[in-house]
């Protein structure tokens, strides 16, 4: 099943997020992703856990998954690099870099997103944008077009309360509020964008969605700048 959904969001403006990628398995949307360099897409490591025998590709320049669009192009993956410390049973280090078979053709609908390199927490309350093609309601309806939602960043102390994530949120993770509006599983690997800069990647751990006591968890890209740089180099 696809790993991702946006709950309580709305359809995104077409091609207004030219960094947005759909990581696909055997031609079907699996996870979100974000173009961080001409030939590299950042996503979540857990996305490829069940993809051993399948064909992984990356769709760029898309708004609709099914309709023809001039900017849409499907790229093969030359190399998949999960973070060496990612493990199936934890949400830690849940990052994946996908090297496209060739440099993406850039244009108004396909453009890398600057990512945060300064390793400081985003201020609580900051409104950040998360987008994806995941399921849009609890009944499991999958959207054809890209959805998005604005979410306020939640401070780590609150997120780590026993009633919330009970200490699981390390310095390398961040949280966003999840009161009816939320990202979830199937949007894993997608971008959390604050002030036009990539700050987080949706983690792909299983979690109840849209419940304010179970905030959304995102991997802080700034904490992994050294690893990202070392792979992209």
């Amino acid at each position: 099943p696809p790993r991702g959904r946006i709950l309580g969001g709305r359809e995104a403006e077409a091609h207004a997020r030219p960094y947005m990628a759909s990581v696909q398995l055997n031609g079907a949307h699996l996870c979100g992703g974000v173009l961080v360099a001409e030939q590299w897409v950042l996503s979540a490591a857990h996305c490829l856990e069940d993809a051993a025998d399948g064909k992984v590709q990356v769709l760029l320049g898309a708004h609709s998954l099914s309709q023809p669009e001039p900017s849409k192009r499907l790229y093969d993956v030359l190399r998949a690099v999960p973070h060496p410390d990612s493990q199936p049973d934890t949400i830690d280090h849940d990052l994946l870099l996908l090297q496209l078979s060739e440099k993406a053709t850039l244009g108004p609908a396909v453009r890398p997103l600057p990512w945060q390199r300064v390793d400081r927490d985003v201020a609580p309350g900051t409104l950040c944008d998360v987008a994806g093609w995941g399921i849009v309601n609890h009944a499991g309806r999958r959207p054809d077009s890209l959805q998005h939602v604005l979410l306020p960043v939640l401070d780590r102390a609150t997120c780590n309360r026993r009633t919330h994530h009970d200490g699981a949120i390390t310095e390398r993770l961040m949280c966003a509020e999840s009161n009816r509006r939320d990202s979830c599983k199937g949007d894993s690997g997608g971008p959390l964008v604050c002030g036009g800069v990539l700050e987080g990647v949706v983690t792909s751990g299983s979690r109840v969605c849209g419940n304010r006591k179970k905030p959304g968890i995102y991997t802080r890209v700034a904490s992994y700048a050294a690893w990202i740089d070392s792979v992209l180099a």
Partner: antibody, heavy 122, light 107 residues
């Protein structure tokens, strides 16, 4: 054989600048990332920063941002580091280094230059 | 910045012995730790990367391991040529940082 050959020792006055070089051989220079590391006698190692030769991107340790400037001349396969406003604290051995390994992730260093000794004295 | 602490500045051992050199990270660094050997007058030489992967040509008497934020370099069957400084390095996040070093002395 992959090698990094560094320029000779430098003696400089306080307040002056020095520019040292690191010449690579045995591999495709323009596709690698050259890091610089400082070592003072009897002390540990300090990472200064790097220059990615593929895209000319530099990343500095904040501590050295106003001290070091990293450049390269790809035509001669040579990387340079200029240290400015020298003080006695800058007296040290400076090594260039890079990761050759086929692992292709993580900034560890399996090729090192022999080092350039900088002495700052009035 | 992540601080890498090598508690023992000096360690003394005998040829044939087994010695454990430790390094503690001030916060989680995953397995992104390397170990280097530096003999007098030489540049550092890599021994181990990703906590436990031995670099090409490094004798198998050198092994690396981890428990949480504690990292160890074990040298079994110490040889006289192992007399050197040993440094750990984390490369999980910027700035990359090194331990202060442990000088291994042969009795």
């Amino acid at each position: 054989q992959v090698q990094l050959q560094q320029s000779g020792a430098e003696l400089a006055r306080p307040g002056a600048s020095v520019k040292m070089s690191c010449k690579a051989s045995g591999y495709t220079f323009a596709t690698y990332t050259i890091h610089w590391v400082k070592q003072r006698p009897g002390q540990g190692l300090e990472w200064i920063g790097y220059l990615n030769l593929r895209n000319d991107y530099t990343h500095y340790n904040q501590k050295f941002r106003d001290k070091a400037a990293l450049t390269a001349d790809k035509s001669s396969s040579t990387a340079y580091m200029q240290l400015s406003s020298l003080t006695s604290e800058d007296s040290a051995v400076y090594n260039c280094a890079f990761r050759l390994g086929n692992d292709r992730q993580g900034w560890y260093f399996d090729v090192w230059g022999a080092g350039t000794t900088v002495t700052v004295s009035s | 910045d992540i601080v890498m602490t090598q508690a023992h500045r000096f360690m003394s051992t005998s040829v044939g012995d087994r010695v454990i050199i430790s390094c503690k990270a001030s916060q989680d660094v995953g397995t992104a730790v390397a170990w280097y050997q530096q003999t007098p007058g030489q540049s550092p030489k890599i021994l181990i990367y990703w906590t436990s992967t031995r670099h090409t040509g490094v004798p198998d008497r050198f092994t690396g391991s981890r428990s949480g934020t504690d990292f160890t370099l074990t040298i079994s069957n110490v040889q006289s040529e192992d007399l050197a400084d040993y440094f750990c390095q984390q490369y999980t996040t910027y700035p990359l940082t090194f331990g202060g070093g442990t000088k291994l002395e042969i009795k």
